[in-house]
Interface confidence: medium
């Protein structure tokens, strides 16, 4: 089965590692930038809409997450929204901003030890629990993950980075959304735009990691619009 | 232009094994996954597995765990699929993937 | 038998909709994984339609759409054309077999 894409906070939805950039740690780049789909033998790019509609907060953006425009209004129109910072009303883990979750109806800061055993334990999507996560690396038997609740190695596919181990997110990969390793100071990363350019990325990359922002590379400035390079750097 | 390009159909005897190639351009070969996908004559596509070509990494899928190996070479762009102790019925077009591009595919003929 | 179902064949007259559907269950379509489409023609690679459900590649008609409900996914095709005729397959991942999996493919024939 073949490889997949997306992209969200908790990063949403997706199988193990079929198509996309790997992200490896060690790279420069962890994964390809991905509003692109090669269709034919050309790269297209993927239609866009503005709002963008959709029906689970899988479909947008890592800072986004779906939900009715207006309080109380037709569940049946959902775009993608601006995700929550920190401090501000929740009331599921997508709804905040990378690296922050949501706790007692409010967007916290999500470090590390207490994040990790806590989200697990408290997401209730409507997936039910039953999904296991793949170790990404060789193996010739399969555990039953109940038994063997082990978070996912890179590579593993993931609905959630709540599967993940330390240091990973679940990203899109085109086939699935697979553990991918958070980026790290200098690593290229993924700017979304609120407007216009929206789409799924085929191959999403994580959200930088603690204490780093995605911010366009000084060296850059002067570049165009189009082609200026962000990279996760120190706040 | 990111292509994969396979190697040509194979012909082998029960009991032998086969080794398929898929030399890939035109992108990162070590920022992605290759899968492996069959498809026997007149059926459906089957996933087989698939390799992290930067560590080397697979997974298999539980059919072929005991038959098959994956591995690449990063120097090169390749990656490679080998089904060990061939029967008729892997008799397919084996095809190997990087989810959003698909190699043209290599038909393996297993017959005495 | 394949993990995700789909009808054997179906049929329809130029200009007309059919539909496609694909049955999975609760470790796979049912879990939250993503359903994808592919169109294959006779001798070729399979060809990406939809992903994620129902999105489409730039290049792909808009009279191709999917959609998703429970544990099925769906896709339609209107306006069906004679160069519609090919096999189409769904695919998903299952958490239970740790594998990517295919529906059985379904051959459309336009009359």
């Known amino acids: 089965t073949l490889n997949s894409v997306l992209n969200s906070n908790a990063i949403k939805n997706l199988p193990p590692p079929l198509g996309g950039a790997a992200g490896h740690p060690g790279s420069a780049v962890s994964a390809a930038p991905g509003i692109l789909y090669p269709g034919g033998n050309k790269y297209q790019t993927i239609d866009n809409y503005q709002p963008y509609p959709c029906a689970e907060d899988e479909e947008c953006g890592t800072d986004e997450y779906c939900a009715s425009p207006t309080r109380g209004g037709d569940a049946g129109v959902q775009i993608c929204l601006a995700c929550r910072k920190r401090r501000k009303r929740c009331m599921r883990h997508a709804m905040c901003c990378p690296g922050n979750y949501c706790k007692n109806g409010i967007c916290v800061s999500s470090d590390q030890n207490h994040f990790r055993g806590e989200i697990e334990e408290t997401i209730t999507e409507s997936f039910g629990n039953d999904h296991s996560t793949l170790d990404g690396y060789s193996r010739r038997t399969t555990l039953s993950s109940k038994m063997y609740h082990t978070k996912g190695q890179e590579g593993s596919v993931c609905l959630r980075s709540s599967d993940c181990a330390s240091g990973l997110c679940c990203a899109r990969h085109f086939w699935s959304k697979i553990c991918k390793p958070v980026l790290k100071e200098g690593q290229v990363c993924t700017k979304h735009r609120r407007k216009g350019s929206h789409g799924l990325e085929i191959f999403q990359r994580c959200y930088c990691g603690e204490g780093l922002s995605c911010r366009i590379q000084k060296d850059h400035h002067q570049a165009s619009n189009s082609s200026r390079l962000h990279t996760c750097q120190r706040h | 232009e990111v292509q994969l390009v396979q190697s040509g159909a194979e012909v082998k005897k029960p009991g032998a094994s086969v080794k398929v190639s898929c030399k890939a351009s035109g992108y990162t070969f070590t920022d992605y996954y290759i899968h492996w996908v069959r498809q026997a004559p007149g059926q459906g596509l089957e996933w087989m597995g698939w390799i992290h070509s930067n560590s080397g990494a697979t997974t298999y899928a539980q059919k072929f765990q005991a038959r098959v190996t994956m591995s690449r070479d990063t120097s090169s762009s390749t990656a490679y699929m080998e089904l060990s102790r061939l029967e008729s019925d892997d008799t397919a077009m084996y095809f190997c993937s990087r989810e959003d591009y698909w190699g043209q595919g290599t038909l393996v003929t297993v017959s005495s | 038998q394949s993990v995700l179902t789909q009808p054997p064949s179906v049929s329809g007259a130029p200009g007309q909709r059919v539909t496609i559907s694909c049955t999975g269950s609760?470790?796979?379509?049912?879990?939250?994984?993503?359903v994808h489409w592919y169109q294959q023609l006779p001798g070729t690679a399979p060809k990406l339609l939809i992903y994620g459900y129902s999105n489409r590649p730039s290049g792909v008609p808009d009279r191709f759409s999917g959609s998703k409900s429970g544990a099925s996914a769906s896709l339609a095709i209107t306006g069906l054309r004679p160069d519609d005729e090919a096999d189409y397959y769904c695919?998903?991942?299952?958490?239970?077999?740790?594998?990517?999996?295919f529906g059985g493919g379904t051959q459309l024939t336009v009359l």
């Open positions: 695919q998903s991942y299952d958490n239970s077999l740790s594998s990517y999996v």
């Open positions: 609760s470790s796979n379509i049912g879990a939250g994984y993503d």
